[in-house]
């Protein structure tokens, strides 16, 4: 049976917590990705940004989980949800920012 949205979001948050806590060397070796607007369409935008990073096992599970939240197919080089590409940040910072936002959504009961 499908996983309830609240459970899926909780699992994504737990995965991001796991990434940030277990980070020893720079995450994804310092790869940089487009920062995203966290106010709308956060899951697809986050996936569109992170999907461009390959060969980084630490975020592969996150990429798969985000794929489950995004209703449309996302492929590398696609930026329809990003809207404005204004700055690139390290993946580590991206994950931290995303985690803070998703915790806020969870507290507010916004599960999808």
């Amino acid at each position: 049976s499908p996983v309830p949205p609240s459970t899926a979001l909780k699992e994504l948050i737990e995965e991001l917590v796991n990434i940030t806590q277990n980070q020893k060397a720079p995450l994804c070796n310092g790869s940089m990705v487009w920062s995203i607007n966290l106010t709308a369409g956060v899951y697809c935008a986050a996936l569109e940004s992170l999907i461009n990073v390959s060969g980084c096992s630490a975020i592969e599970k996150t990429q798969r989980m985000l794929n489950g939240f995004c209703p449309h197919k996302v492929s590398a080089g696609q930026f329809s949800s990003l809207r404005v590409r204004d700055t690139k940040i390290e993946v580590a910072q991206f994950v931290k920012d995303l985690l803070v936002h998703l915790k806020k959504l969870f507290r507010e009961g916004q599960f999808n």
Epitope: P26, N29, S31, M32, S54, G55, G77
Partner: nanobody
């Protein structure tokens, strides 16, 4: 294997100009999004600029907008960064990077020092 080699750094006075170059090999350059990233002494990495494969899109950090220009020559597998109106705070090692790759695949960097 991705290989990148930057050049063109040096010592320049405030207000001066430099043009950085980066020669790429080991991957299909003309379909790759490319970045310039810098690291000031004792600071973290800072994204500077990005250019799309087709040259249609160019993007800049607010700190360099209007002063720096990114460009590329796909026939020469070369990325450029024209830096004008240089300031002391632009002092850093500048790295050329194939977008979305880690530091192990970046070039060694070229040092830009802005000082009078």
């Amino acid at each position: 294997e991705v290989q990148l080699l930057e050049s063109g750094g040096g010592l320049v006075q405030p207000g001066g100009s430099l043009r950085l170059s980066c020669v790429a090999s080991g991957f299909t350059f003309d379909v790759a999004e490319m970045d310039w990233v810098r690291q000031a002494p004792g600071k973290g990495l800072e994204w500077v600029s990005t250019i799309s494969p087709s040259r249609r899109g160019t993007y800049y950090a607010d700190s360099v907008k209007g002063r720096f220009t990114i460009s590329r020559d796909n026939s020469k597998n070369t990325l450029y960064l024209q830096m004008n109106s240089l300031r002391a705070e632009d002092t850093a090692v500048y790295y050329c990077a194939k977008a979305y790759t880690g530091r192990s695949l970046w070039g060694p960097g070229t040092l830009v020092t802005v000082s009078s």
